[in-house]
Amino acid sequence: VPPGEDSKDVAAPHRQPLTSSERIDKQIRYILDGISALRKETCNKSNMCESSKEALAENNLNLPKMAEKDGCFQSGFNEETCLVKIITGLLEFEVYLEYLQNRFESSEEQARAVQMSTKVLIQFLQKKAKNLDAITTPDPTTNASLLTKLQAQNQWLQDMTTHLILRSFKEFLQSSLRALRQM
């Protein structure tokens, strides 16, 4: 490889292009890397990561979560139902990812990257889904008022909300990745 050239780029023409499933898989892993980086800043900044008061704040957040009925677990696995749940869940997370945008100092770009990568992931998954009619898009007005409400919280609650969003999004993506690998 010539100096200064990346061997991956040189080999690229001989590499098989990624399949749709591989692209989705890689995208989820990329987002999870981003979430982990954001959590480092959150945990360094406050003691939220060790907090046992999570349950209190969690009650006020309606964060998407995988349940048995969603068809993503192996017992009762249903590819179409599960795919709809993953897309719907990601669309519901978008307002929370918007909330995160002003929550980071040194990781501002990382927060933006997580948000934009999630939009791309949704597009990848929508191409894969056959039953797009079953996907309900969150109401913009409801999202706007939720955003205002979250931003009006005191500092402690905002820190806790940030922590909970990142943790829940991570778990949702992990569940999604396990399910997508079964498809």
Epitope: L32, S36, F73, Q74, S75, R167, K170, E171, R178, R181
Partner: antibody
Amino acid sequence: EVQLQESGPGLVKPSQTLSLTCTVSGGSIATSYYAWSWIRQPPGKGLEWMGVIDYDGDTYYKPSLKSRTSISRDTSKNQFSLQLSSVTPEDTAVYYCARAGLGDSYYLGTYYAMDYWGKGTLVTVSS
Amino acid sequence: QAVLTQPPSMSGTLGKTLTISCNGTSSDIGSGNYVSWYQQLPGTTPKLLIEGVTTRVSGIPDRFSGSKSDNTASLTISGLQSEDEATYYCASYRETNNVVFGGGTHLTVLG
């Protein structure tokens, strides 16, 4: 070479809290996507997974032990700890700490493969 | 009470092949390629042999192999040797965010 070493009291009274610490050497618990687990083995019996703390500091516990178990970490000391409250003689066991997280485990949240183990420490619950 | 079911004991003959089964459900073994196998020699710490159902860990001889069919995982030991006499445990990821072990199989190697 990663090495793990459990430490803590060998005797705990019933109803008290069992506290164990695992010190990791040969690698930092704060780098790379590994997770850190606790497993126990009652005398003459099989292995029982108790819980795990992952790279981000998130904890997951065996459902039947969840109300009594707490796992935490201290990255500055390269240690992670187990606390088990309201112990009974049935909690008498050899307690192992172990590293998990091979391959894609972090991305999948599947910490089922433990590649490095401590030697184990026997904890007896008795008055 | 272990969640995954293994035969408590088995015996095999030197040089022969033996397979240990590990039965679970669609929530654990059936949920993906998330099965591992451990060997515990008497009085020692468990040692990881196999992860990801079939992947042998570095340094483990190729006499040990893993497989899975539906909700059952298997560990096959070919060319049995006297040093294989140990207790073998299977483990699996279990939905959600959980790990379960089998009860263990004590293997006796007969001359």
